[in-house]
């Protein structure tokens, strides 16, 4: 018996060939011997089967002795043995119809689980072999689960259902809802304007939800909510904002926040959360602010940084075009009785400058000038 695999919703064509290459009488029946379709001369006739409106044949092939049964919009329950009767012969074809679907929404939050469910006919014992967009293979039976979805899991999942050494292939598009970056650091000199951007790693027609930025300043004992906002069809509206600092927020995506001035008391780390409508759970992005200040008080030139810096970062003070006078893995460095000239305070990571602040030291009878 020939086995044919079909895909739920697709069209299948079951073949039946006579030895005579001419139009002769044929009919297709199901395993219950109920007639599906056949011919009367050059006319297609249909029987009382459940397939009535979805069954067809190709009249153009009858003259060649081919009498196919075409079933449109396949359903799992179409799985059956179909019998073609032609020239006193019976050709049997077993049709097995499978469906593979994501059991929840195909738009999932980062960290959530994806479950693919296989619909299969009774008595079948298929296996499912799926491949993620990043090339990872996963095998399963009736269900296949992937926990802790990552951003790289967004895209087309390709799956092969195997039964009786035959296969049927599926593709499922999955969107992992996440921010483009899990974390970011902004380095600013004291007094500069700070721009925080929170680009999303996905695009959808309508995006509705609400969000909040909580901030833990390095100098503060507890975190506080800096801003809350609503998102409606990709339009942003601020609900509540602290008075200090007075943040401003862009009205369109990507989510964009502006802090008028970088000050030591604001240095620290924040967590922006976004709750999307009809989704359980939230999207998160961490943002960090590092602030630098260079000052001269009497005979002491000091450079300080505030905020989350890693131990490998180097802070140094140097007179321009000269070797660094002081260079330490510390958050503050100073030089006593600095020479006159333009001094540079540098925060660097393996030689790459992350932040730079210049201060002009005048001869001792003058007061310093900050450019």
């Amino acid at each position: 018996k020939k086995v044919v695999l079909g895909k739920k919703g697709d069209t299948v064509e079951l073949t039946c060939t006579a030895s005579q290459k001419k139009s002769i009488q044929f009919h297709w029946k199901n395993s219950n011997q109920i007639k599906i379709l056949g011919n009367q001369g050059s006319f297609l006739t249909k029987g009382p089967s459940k397939l009535n409106d979805r069954a067809d044949s190709r009249r153009s092939l009858w003259d060649q002795g081919n009498f196919p049964l075409i079933i449109k919009n396949l359903k799992i329950e179409d799985s059956d043995t179909y019998i073609c009767e032609v020239e006193d012969q019976k050709e049997e074809v077993q049709l097995l119809v499978f469906g593979l679907t994501a059991n929840s929404d195909t738009h999932l939050l980062q960290g959530q689980s994806l479950t693919l469910t296989l619909e299969s006919p009774p008595g079948s014992s298929p296996s499912v072999q799926c491949r993620s967009p990043r090339g990872k293979n996963i095998q399963g039976g009736k269900t296949l689960s992937v926990s802790q979805l990552e951003l790289q899991d967004s895209g087309t999942w390709t799956c092969t259902v195997l039964q009786n050494q035959k296969k049927v292939e599926f593709k499922i598009d999955i969107v992992v809802l996440a921010f483009q970056k899990a974390s970011s650091i902004v380095y600013k000199k004291e007094g500069e304007q700070v721009e925080f951007s929170f680009p999303l790693a996905f695009t959808v027609e309508k995006l509705t939800g609400s969000g909040e930025l909580w901030w833990q300043a390095e100098r503060a004992s507890s975190s506080k909510s800096w801003i809350t906002f609503d998102l409606k069809n990709k339009e942003v509206s601020v609900k509540r904002v602290t008075q200090d600092p007075k943040l401003q927020m862009g009205k369109k995506l990507p989510l964009h926040l502006t802090l008028p001035q970088a000050l030591p008391q604001y240095a620290g780390s924040g967590n922006l959360t976004l709750a999307l409508e009809a989704k359980t759970g939230k999207l998160h992005q961490e943002v960090n602010l590092v602030v630098m200040r260079a000052t001269q008080l009497q005979k002491n030139l000091t450079c300080e940084v505030w905020g989350p810096t890693s131990p490998k970062l180097m802070l140094s003070l140097k007179l321009e075009n000269k070797e660094a006078k002081v260079s330490k893995r510390e958050k503050a460095v100073w030089v006593l009785n600095p020479e006159a000239g333009m001094w540079q305070c540098l925060l660097s990571d393996s030689g790459q400058v992350l932040l730079e602040s210049n201060i002009k030291v005048l001869p001792t009878w003058s007061t310093p000038v900050q450019p």
Partner: antibody, heavy 118, light 106 residues
Framework: EVQLQESGPSLVKPSQTLSLTCSVT????????WNWIRKFPGHKLEFLGY???????NYNPSLKSRVSITRDTSKNQFDLQLKSVTTEDTATYHC????????????WGQGISVTVSS | DIHLTQTTSSLSASLGDRVTIICRAS??????LNWYQLKPDGTLKLLIY???RLHSGVPSRFSGSGSGTEYSLTISNLEREDVATYFC????????FGAGTKLELK
């Protein structure tokens, strides 16, 4: 029977783009996964990438910026492009089929020897 | 990257011998381990896929086993035509290959 046949230049100059074609008979490239693998002179094997029945691609991360695989379903062919080649890319390039998605290459082309030299 | 180590780079055996080739993975590969035969004429053939499934047309003297990070290919009754280099390859993620084991006759 399934057959795969590689074609393209056997000599490529450094910094140029290597372009190879795999012609498939006996199966349709709109089903399964279609791969490129190369074999270095010492028999070391390296996976380059694949194109799937769904027209999705994946590449070896070490070559990602240089490699591209495309297909032409009307000709039942799929192509490999490797940019900015160096002498290190001298190898025998094979195309292969993975029918069921296990990365199990059940049919291989006989391979095409490519030398990168000025 | 998942690294595969074939502990023996070459081995000699006599006709009729039982030969086992070992392949170790740097992490659990969930049984996605395939074995290939590279003949001296350069032809590559799939022998075993998904640890123990025999590819169609491959003689039953070839078998595979293993789990986690340790896998093996066994030829139960060595024949002259089995002289070749054998490669393991993981298919858990984007494929990587072992360095190969060259099998010769004593």
């Amino acid at each position: 029977e399934v057959q795969l046949q590689e074609s393209g230049p056997s000599l490529v100059k450094p910094s140029q783009t290597l372009s190879l074609t795999c012609s498939v008979t006996g199966d349709s490239i709109t089903s399964g996964y279609w791969n490129w693998i190369r074999k270095f002179p010492g028999h070391k094997l390296e996976f380059l990438g694949y194109i799937s029945f769904a027209d999705t691609t994946n590449y070896n991360p070490s070559l990602k910026s240089r490699v591209s695989i495309t297909r032409d379903t009307s000709k039942n062919q799929f192509d490999l492009q490797l940019k900015s080649v160096t002498t290190e890319d001298t190898a025998t390039y094979h195309c292969a089929r993975d029918d069921y998605g296990y990365y199990a290459m059940d049919y291989w082309g006989q391979g095409i020897s490519v030398t990168v030299s000025s | 990257d998942i690294h595969l180590t074939q502990t023996t780079s070459s081995l000699s055996a006599s006709l009729g011998d039982r030969v086992t080739i070992i392949c170790r993975a740097s992490q659990d590969i969930d049984n996605y381990l395939n074995w290939y035969q590279l003949k001296p004429d350069g032809t590559l053939k799939l022998l075993i896929y998904y640890t123990s499934r025999l590819h169609s047309g491959v003689p039953s003297r070839f078998s595979g086993s293993g789990s986690g990070t340790e896998y093996s290919l066994t030829i139960s009754n060595l024949e002259r035509e089995d002289v070749a280099t054998y490669f393991c390859q993981q298919g858990n993620t984007l494929p990587t290959f072992g360095a190969g084991t060259k099998l010769e006759l004593k």
